[in-house]
């Protein structure tokens, strides 16, 4: 004799999220009275979502009339789909009883797949700036996507990067997934306008892959380069030295000079001049009157540069009729405190 | 839905009435019987459906027996008295969201010595 | 086991008035929705008016209404006609799938 079936003609179902998910369910007899019920997962632990008879589901609409004679269509609409939904959802039949109803039938389950679209992905890079030749590590996340499979590539000015390391968790089944890789990059001088970028290709996204970047100049220091130079005599026992400050990034830089040792000027970069490459070019000039000085003069040029140590470069002025042009290099000097934020 | 197989009888001469359905299929709806005694309301008495899902009101239990074929629900009143004489009607469904309609005419039963 | 209470006996009803039969439950019926109610005349077959306390079975006309859930139901004829007259039963489910108990009914007459 025939008993009452309940038939979940589709073993699963692929849903965006936000979407609204199908859950198809039908029956092949009226018989027992009773009503439908629908849960997600099998087991004690199983979750209700929908039961024909009572209760308030706000997310769930059938998508026949119940109340309608004859009826036999017990499928469901789940609105606003979360990764949260993903499951196995199980149309159970009920035989009216007292207490409670009783179980009769189940379908064999419907497994509910979400396809959630991954969060743009975040790249940061390290937290102090690093000088060319060295190697920095810049980092991307992205989460809530759904399925595990996904696809991250590194880039720097278009170039695809190989030295990067890339996870997936959680390693096991869950609802939704979050990527995290670390990309190892090597800064060179000419990066003040290099970016890094960081591309996620996702099943959801339809060959429209996401993109995080970062630039490099937030991560970058190019430290300048000094050059003391004495211009020709302006004016009776007068002399022009110059104190060329070339190629530095960021432009946050002070400059001092020595004369013989003691601080004659400082001041702060401000009208400088930008290259191609991003970097900065600024130019100090001192007049000095040489009438003043008995014996030679030794002329510092030294600049802080985004809180380093200071460098230096030095001018040895000859007192005589006919000063002529001489630079030396001196070591690096520490005029003193990183701290000052002289901008 | 047509009923059909109610006569006079004897008390305690077994009865059985028949239902005769078309147009649905016995193996997706429930027959449920009611009947009327004269001058009195409608009664409830059981509703037959497959093997396992027939099911009768507490006061008709051993009274009633069920059986069904492919076209025909049968009720048998097991061992009739003069209380079981009543108006017997057949009705697809089996009540909550799948009520009784439509109904048979009807079947006059008599049971008298 | 469910005892369902159906007043009044009998009402009469001008045409174009309305009527009111009630029925209540000696508890909660099944799902609190599990009550129909039944038009029935001398000689014919009953008819399904309403089920699932509200639902308007299909053809019946929209001057009969029922609302109603748990122990209180009600059937409401407004603008009632003479093709009315007729007994009314209410027919409620327990918590038992064999749990169907009829009320007493309510004869209408209409003047």
């Known amino acids: 004799e025939e008993e009452l079936q309940v038939i979940q003609p589709d073993k699963s179902v692929l849903v965006a999220a936000g979407e609204t998910a199908t859950l198809r369910c039908t029956a092949t007899s009226l018989i027992p009275v009773g009503p439908i019920q629908w849960f997600r997962g099998a087991g004690p632990g199983r979750e209700l979502i929908y039961n024909q008879k009572e209760g308030h589901f706000p997310r769930v609409t059938t998508v026949s009339d119940l109340t309608k004679r004859n009826n036999m269509d017990f499928s469901i609409r789940i609105g606003n789909i979360t990764p949260a939904d993903a499951g196995t959802y199980y149309c159970v039949k009920f035989r009216k009883g007292s207490p409670d109803d009783v179980e009769f039938k189940s379908g064999a389950g419907t497994e509910l797949s979400v396809r959630a679209k991954p969060s743009a992905p975040v790249v940061s890079g390290p937290a102090a700036r690093a000088t060319p030749q060295h190697t920095v590590s810049f980092t991307c996340e992205s989460h809530g996507f759904s399925p595990r499979d996904i696809t991250l590539k590194w880039f720097k000015n278009g170039n695809e990067l190989s030295d990067f390391q890339t996870n997936v968790d959680p390693v096991g089944e869950s609802v939704s997934y979050s990527i995290h890789s670390t990309a190892k990059v090597v800064l060179t001088r000419e990066d003040v306008h290099s970016q890094v970028i960081c591309e996620v290709a996702h099943v959801t996204l339809q060959g429209d892959p996401l993109r995080g970047t970062a630039n490099l100049s937030e991560t970058i220091r190019v430290p300048p380069t000094l050059e003391v130079t004495q211009q020709p005599v302006r004016a009776e026992n007068q002399v022009n030295v110059t104190c060329q400050v070339r190629k530095f990034y960021p432009q946050r830089l002070q400059l001092t000079w020595l004369e013989n040792g003691n601080v004659s000027r400082t001041e702060t970069a401000s009208t400088v001049t930008e290259n191609k490459d991003g970097t900065y070019n600024w130019m100090s000039w001192l007049l000095v009157n040489v009438s003043a000085h008995r014996d030679d003069v030794k002329l510092t040029c030294q600049v802080e540069h985004d809180g380093q140590p200071a460098v230096s470069k030095s001018h040895d002025l000859k007192v005589s009729a006919h000063p002529k042009e001489q630079g030396s290099n001196t070591a690096a000097e520490n005029t003193g405190s990183n701290e000052r934020n002289i901008y | 839905v047509e009923e059909s197989g109610g006569r006079l009888v004897t008390p305690g001469t077994p009865l059985t009435l028949t239902c005769t359905v078309s147009g649905f299929s016995l193996s997706s709806h429930g027959i449920s019987w009611v009947r009327q005694a004269p001058g009195k309301g409608l009664e409830y008495i059981g509703t037959i459906g497959t093997g396992v899902i027939t099911y009768f009101a507490s006061w008709a239990k051993g009274r009633f027996t069920g059986s069904k074929t492919s076209t025909t629900v049968d009720l048998k009143i097991t061992s009739p008295t003069t209380e079981d004489t009543a108006t017997y009607f057949c009705?697809?469904?089996?009540?909550?969201?799948?009520?009784?309609?439509?109904w048979g005419p009807g079947t006059l039963v008599t049971v008298s010595s | 086991a469910l005892v369902m209470t159906q007043t009044p006996a009998s009402v009469s009803a001008a045409v174009g008035g309305t009527v009111t039969t009630k029925c209540q439950a000696s508890?909660?019926?099944?799902?609190?929705?599990?009550l129909a109610w039944y038009q029935h005349k001398p000689g014919q077959p009953p008819k399904l008016l309403i089920y699932?306390?509200?639902t308007l079975a299909t053809g019946v006309p929209s001057r009969f209404s029922g609302s109603g859930s748990g122990t209180q139901f009600t059937l409401t004829i407004t603008g009632v006609q003479s093709d009315d007259a007729a007994t009314y039963y209410c027919?409620?489910?327990?918590?038992?799938?064999?749990?169907?108990?009829f009320g007493g009914g309510t004869e209408v007459v209409v003047k």
């Open positions: 508890q909660s019926v099944y799902g609190n929705n599990d």
């Open positions: 699932l306390a509200s």
């Open positions: 027919l409620g489910g327990g918590d038992d799938e064999a749990d169907n108990v």
């Open positions: 009705a697809r469904g089996s009540a909550w969201n799948d009520p009784f309609d439509p």
